[in-house]
């Protein structure tokens, strides 16, 4: 079996963590978040070729069926395996509050 | 805000549970599984338009950035939110064994 972390499509082409710089406006948050003004958003981007970072048995099945029926079954998709928490300083009706979100920034990625 | 379960692309076009009939050969299991001979594989297929079954804050961010930078950031993707377990009767060196897999069949779907 191919090494599950070696990308057969070339360096950086397969499912991995990327960082995208975004403003509050980019995120659609300007009306309800005060800080941070800008976010380094970590997200999972890239192709999921066979056996690459397969999350589970379902991902294996999906890849096998995709090869058989590519028009019916899509290839596995690169999604977060876990997340890093982030605190936002939010506007409220009465002022501001701190809110921690556990599902905002991807920490690592896999194919499902 | 649009109803998170109403598909704006038309019935059945958005992220939802599909069933795909597959044989052991289709799944690549013929050499290590005895039963079942055929599987009704439930999997998540379909588009993830804005606000449709968004799994979490990360999915919202991803959609907003996808609209801004479609060549850099892909749209959210339709993946299992949970799984149904399934038991397989497996071949072993000495005969057969029962093995339950918790991550084989999708139970419901969301966009990440």
């Amino acid at each position: 079996a191919r090494n599950g972390d070696r990308c057969p499509l070339g360096p950086g082409r397969c499912c991995r963590l990327h960082t995208v710089h975004a403003s509050l406006e980019d995120l659609g948050w300007a009306d309800w978040v005060l800080s941070p003004r800008e976010v380094q958003v970590t997200m999972c981007i890239g192709a999921c070729p066979s056996q690459f970072r397969e999350a589970n048995m379902h991902a294996q099945i999906k890849m096998n069926l995709h090869r058989l029926k590519p028009d019916t079954v899509p290839a596995p998709c690169c999604v977060p395996a876990s997340y890093n928490p982030m605190v936002l300083i939010q506007k409220t009706d009465t002022g501001v509050s701190l809110q921690t979100y556990d599902d905002l920034l991807a920490k690592d990625c896999h194919c499902v | 805000a649009r109803n998170g379960d109403r598909c704006p692309l038309g019935p059945g076009r958005c992220c939802r549970l599909h069933t795909v009939h597959a044989s052991l050969e289709d799944l690549g299991w013929a050499d290590w599984v005895l039963s079942p001979r055929e599987v009704q594989v439930t999997m998540c297929i379909g588009a993830c338009p804005s606000q449709f079954r968004e799994a979490n804050m990360h999915a919202q961010i991803k959609m907003n950035l996808h609209r801004l930078k479609p060549d850099t950031v892909p749209a959210p993707c339709c993946v299992p939110a949970s799984y149904n377990p399934m038991v397989l009767i497996q071949k072993t060196d000495t005969g057969v064994s029962l093995q339950t897999y918790d991550d084989l069949l999708a139970k419901d779907c969301h966009c990440v």
Epitope: L34, N84, V87, I89, T100, L105 | -
Partner: antibody, heavy 118, light 106 residues
Framework: QVQLQESGPGLVKPSETLSLTCTFS??????????VGWIRQPPGKGLEWLAH???????RYNPALKSRLTISKDSSKSQISLKLSSVTAADTAVYYC??????????WGQGTTVTVSS | DIQMTQSPSSLSASVGDRVTITCKAS??????VAWYQQKPGQSPKALIY???YRSSGVPSRFSGSGSGTDFTLTISSLQPEDFATYYC????????FGQGTRLEIK
Amino acid sequence: QVQLQESGPGLVKPSETLSLTCTFSGFSLSTSGMGVGWIRQPPGKGLEWLAHILWDDVKRYNPALKSRLTISKDSSKSQISLKLSSVTAADTAVYYCVQMAWDWFAYWGQGTTVTVSS
Amino acid sequence: DIQMTQSPSSLSASVGDRVTITCKASQNVDTNVAWYQQKPGQSPKALIYSASYRSSGVPSRFSGSGSGTDFTLTISSLQPEDFATYYCQQYHSYPTFGQGTRLEIK
């Protein structure tokens, strides 16, 4: 519920190094945007920011005191230490540990009094 | 560094009075200003963030305004528990505080 508890020696001799510890709970320093800082207040005077350490291990120091300050976090991530070297009587103050959310000093500890005297 | 100059340094007022404390930055700090309240023998408490947003649990009689270099903290109707020292702070560059305004009972 956020809690910060400062601990220190109480009395330090001139020219020695002051070591302070902040033990915190109710938040995680591995959360993006979180930080822990130190602010001091000499008797009867105003507030002076000393240093802070952020979730990503970035450290910031007051330029006027930078050469004398060292901030660090314990591997358990629930303790922050501050060292101030070559102390003089001017370093006598109440030292506060503060939770930072991004750039805001959101929650303050009760403070620990440090006197520099021989 | 950015200097924050508060005025007045102290003032006397009565319960029910409207009180305004001003803070002037030595250079433009946008709205990157916070206000804190400190009662005798206690640690400071966050009141206002981003010039005008009240911290959670702060009564509505406290309000902040301003941007650029000029900022104000207003207490619309003084209550007995409001007699304290108030500090402004900028976080546009490394943090600096005003010298404080002591609010006393007349």
